[in-house]
């Protein structure tokens, strides 16, 4: 009897069962009752990542230098090309077919977590206690200068956006 | 137990054409694939036709394309090789195969073909 | 074509000995290669198929191994009744192709 169903990595065709060509490997001809699949690799360029009847391997993805993208991982007969963002900018999406720059933190704000190739800056506000007065991809929120270490007096009041202004303390006169 | 029996083989001239039969028994004919396979002098096998279980796809190599035609009635159990325009070079000992597992399973006892002036 | 070149063309043994037989194929066929028996003035007889899965009713010593383009057939402990010709045959695509053939002989 011909078969239904087929065992993993084959497929049925003309009520049997032939052999999948294996990842990096395009589909030649499909078997017959006196040969087996003929399958052939994908060219420079090209690509299978699965076991496969597919008649025409994948294009490697374009990594576009105008779009901000480079290189990450280079891509095989089995594998896709991983692009990532040039430094300083990072991907739109998960697929990385395009790169925005990095965003700043506003003054008032600092960074969280700095931007890679695939995730933009994290900013958080700046909480009572420190400050960030420049607009910057890369600068945490720094810690109000403590006047009473340098034997100092608060003559301004921080922000979250501008630091303490100490000053010397008022002497009594003798 | 599958038997294979070839005949129809013969001595005749270049040129000419002959028709061989192979009588199946023992299995489902229907249900397999069948070949013809040669073997000259020198013990050299050589592929010359296959011919799909229904019968709709037949297989040839270059070299005989054109001369010769694989057929089969599934209702007789009968596998045929009709061979024309033969060439001393044809002269050989014919087998019928049935393929199982896409291997050449069984074998007949084989027909001989000279093709001789 | 896939050229199939097998060594050696003859092959000299002493019974109880063990024999190695090449099959070399011009291009990669994966494993798709058959290997045949043929007894003198008898009928070649399937041993091998897939390059080394065993075949009902065929003594177990008789193996056989390789992908891609080399291919061994084993006989160990050769007996009187294994002379003969040994041929592989691919089936990795059209047209069919055989080797040239080992022969087997007493020595």
């Known amino acids: 009897e011909p078969p239904t169903a087929c065992r993993e990595k084959q497929y049925l065709i003309n009520s049997q069962c032939c052999s999948l060509c294996q990842p990096g490997q395009k589909l030649v001809s499909d078997c017959t009752e006196f040969t087996e699949t003929e399958c052939l690799p994908c060219g420079e360029s090209e690509f299978l990542d699965t076991w496969n009847r597919e008649t025409h391997c994948h294009q490697h993805k374009y990594c576009d230098p105008n779009l901000g993208l480079r290189v990450q991982q280079k891509g095989t007969s089995e594998t896709d090309t991983i692009c990532t963002c040039e430094e300083g900018w990072h991907c739109t999406s998960e697929a990385c077919e395009s790169c925005v720059l990095h965003r700043s933190c506003s003054p008032g704000f600092g960074v969280k977590q700095i931007a890679t190739g695939v995730s933009d800056t994290i900013c958080e506000p700046c909480p009572v206690g420190f400050f960030s007065n420049v607009s910057s991809a890369f600068e945490k929120c720094h810690p109000w200068t403590s006047c009473e270490t340098k034997d100092l007096v608060v003559q301004q009041a921080g922000t979250n956006k501008t630091d303490v202004v100490c000053g010397p303390q008022d002497r009594l006169r003798a | 137990e599958v038997k294979l029996v070839e005949s129809g083989g013969g001595l005749v001239k270049p040129g000419a054409s002959l028709k061989l039969s192979c009588a199946a028994s023992?299995?489902?004919?229907?249900?397999?694939?069948m070949s013809w396979v040669r073997q000259n002098s020198d013990k050299r096998l050589e592929w010359v036709a296959s011919?799909?279980?229904?019968?709709?796809?037949?297989y040839y190599p270059d070299n005989v394309k054109g001369r010769c035609t694989i057929s089969r009635e599934n209702a007789k159990n009968t596998l045929y090789l009709e061979m024309s325009s033969l060439k001393t070079e044809d002269t050989a000992l014919y087998y019928c195969t049935r393929a199982g597992g896409k291997a050449m399973d069984y074998w007949g006892q084989g027909t001989s073909v000279t093709v001789s002036t | 074509d896939i050229v199939l070149t097998q060594s050696p063309a003859t092959l000299s043994v002493i019974p109880g000995n063990s024999v190695s037989l090449s099959c070399r194929a011009s291009?990669?066929?994966?494993?798709?290669l058959h290997w045949y028996q043929q007894k003198s003035h008898e009928s070649p007889r399937l041993l091998i198929n897939?390059?080394?899965q065993s075949i009902s009713g065929i003594p177990s010593r008789f193996s056989g191994s390789g992908s891609g383009t080399d291919f061994t057939l084993t006989i160990n402990s050769v007996e009187t009744e294994d002379f003969g010709i040994y041929f592989c045959q691919q089936f990795n695509s059209w047209p069919l192709t055989f080797g040239g053939g080992t022969k087997l002989e007493l020595k």
């Open positions: 291009q990669s066929i994966r494993d798709n």
């Open positions: 011919i799909s279980s229904g019968g709709d796809d037949t």
């Open positions: 023992g299995f489902t004919f229907s249900n397999y694939g």
């Open positions: 897939y390059a080394s």
